[in-house]
Interface confidence: low
């Protein structure tokens, strides 16, 4: 009776997320049957996310809304560890969108979920950001650093990654 | 004092047009985002349009779009909407809000707004 | 587009008193929830943003809680000064960003 309750319960809350994704991929959490976190299919998962690489190119402002009809955000990189993560489904010639922006041209960077921006969390490559008009944030590939990150303009199409928190169910 | 006033509004028939304006003084208009959210008496509020700190990008309600746009003149600090092919369901106070977070999710600072009465 | 319903209509309390808000909304939208308050001739003022939040200069006493589809917004201790009307607001599918239809707070 406690697990078809349990199942019922599933059950509907699946539904809630339909409208977003018709197709979850969930794996049990620890040792604890009832505990199923679920991520979107083909998204991955990395810890509490869940991570999506769009590959077609958008400006900044139309990326972020590609990943908030799909319930999510523009990535937020929280540690050294998520980005190292995240590199892993990464093409070296590409250039991918960061849920990272100056709005105003002032050098106050923002994360798309107020995430306080912090300097001593963050992977610019050497000389960057370097343009006051350059206002949106990618992360990429130099041959001489590997992955960082760089300030480009906003309404320059760019691929880009967006993350949602999992599922839990 | 961080503030936002509005001024347009009146009495208008239906199918003509005015031009609501939100003057911005405290902080600097050009770092942030601006929507129109409006009023109808005695209702809710209903989300019209948002603008991007540097114009390039607008959105509108579906009630709205095709009939209002949203502009802003960042030297004078100044935002704006025009509203056009006026109708009775547009009779509302209309406020102009700074929108916080990225994109200007929330609204953190309203104006009083300015009532936009149409009536034949 | 998503829709939220705010209950009850109309909530009556008297200073003191703890009160609870509920807004819900037709689909998940993660945590991405505001509220605001609006008192007769005023604008609306931000209280609580993503869910639980609280905004600048917000009293300790309003706290937000919820994801998905169910919020909740409480005020631990009713002062004469709260009593107004609280609107729900989404941001996790836009255009349109959409409101509650509001709860009236009322001394009882």
């Known amino acids: 009776n406690f697990m078809y309750s349990k199942t019922v319960k599933r059950l509907s809350k699946l539904r809630e997320y339909q409208q977003y994704h018709p197709s979850l991929t969930c794996v049990m959490e620890g040792k604890d049957i009832e505990d199923w976190s679920c991520c979107p299919t083909p998204w991955t998962s990395f810890q509490s996310s869940c991570y999506f690489i769009s590959t077609g190119m958008q400006s900044w402002t139309k990326s972020q809304k590609n990943c908030s009809v799909m319930g999510a955000d523009l990535v937020v990189i929280n540690t050294r560890e998520e980005q190292d993560f995240i590199i892993q489904n990464l093409k070296r010639n590409s250039s991918y969108f960061l849920g990272l922006s100056d709005p105003g041209g002032r050098r106050h960077w923002q994360w798309v979920d107020q995430t306080p921006y912090n300097e001593n969390v963050t992977f610019w490559h050497s000389g960057e950001p370097n343009n006051l008009d350059e206002r949106c944030a990618i992360i990429n590939f130099r041959s001489s650093e590997e992955w960082g990150w760089n300030d480009i303009h906003c309404h320059v199409p760019q691929k880009s990654i967006c993350k949602m928190k999992k599922i839990y169910i | 004092q961080v503030q936002l006033v509005e001024s347009g509004g009146g009495v208008v028939q239906p199918g003509r047009s005015l031009r609501l304006s939100c003057a911005a003084s405290?902080?600097?208009?050009?770092?942030?985002?601006m929507h129109w959210v409006r009023q109808a008496p005695g209702k809710g509020l209903e989300w019209v349009a948002v603008i991007w700190y540097d114009g390039n990008d607008k959105y509108y309600a579906d009630s709205v779009k095709g009939r209002f746009t949203i502009s802003r003149d960042n030297s004078k600090n100044t935002l704006y909407l025009q509203v056009n092919s006026l109708r009775a369901e547009d009779t509302a106070v209309y406020y102009c809000?700074?929108?916080?977070?990225?994109?200007?999710?929330?609204?953190?600072?309203w104006g009083r707004g300015t009532l936009v009465t149409v009536s034949s | 587009e998503i829709v939220l319903t705010q209950s009850p209509a109309t909530l009556s309390l008297s200073p003191g008193e703890r009160a609870t808000l509920s807004c819900r909304a037709s689909?998940?939208?993660?945590?991405?929830l505001a509220w605001y308050q609006q008192k007769p001739g005023q604008a609306p003022r931000l209280l609580i943003y993503?869910?639980?939040n609280r905004a600048t200069g917000i009293p300790a006493r309003f706290s937000g809680s919820g994801s998905g589809t169910d919020f909740t917004l409480t005020i631990s201790s009713l002062e004469p000064e709260d009593f107004a009307v609280y609107y729900c607001q989404q941001r996790s599918t836009w255009p349109p960003y959409t409101f509650g239809q509001g709860t009236k707070l009322e001394i009882k």
């Open positions: 993503d869910a639980s």
């Open positions: 809000a700074r929108g916080t977070g990225t994109p200007y999710w929330y609204f953190d600072l």
């Open positions: 689909q998940s939208v993660n945590n991405y």
């Open positions: 405290g902080f600097t208009l050009s770092s942030y985002g």
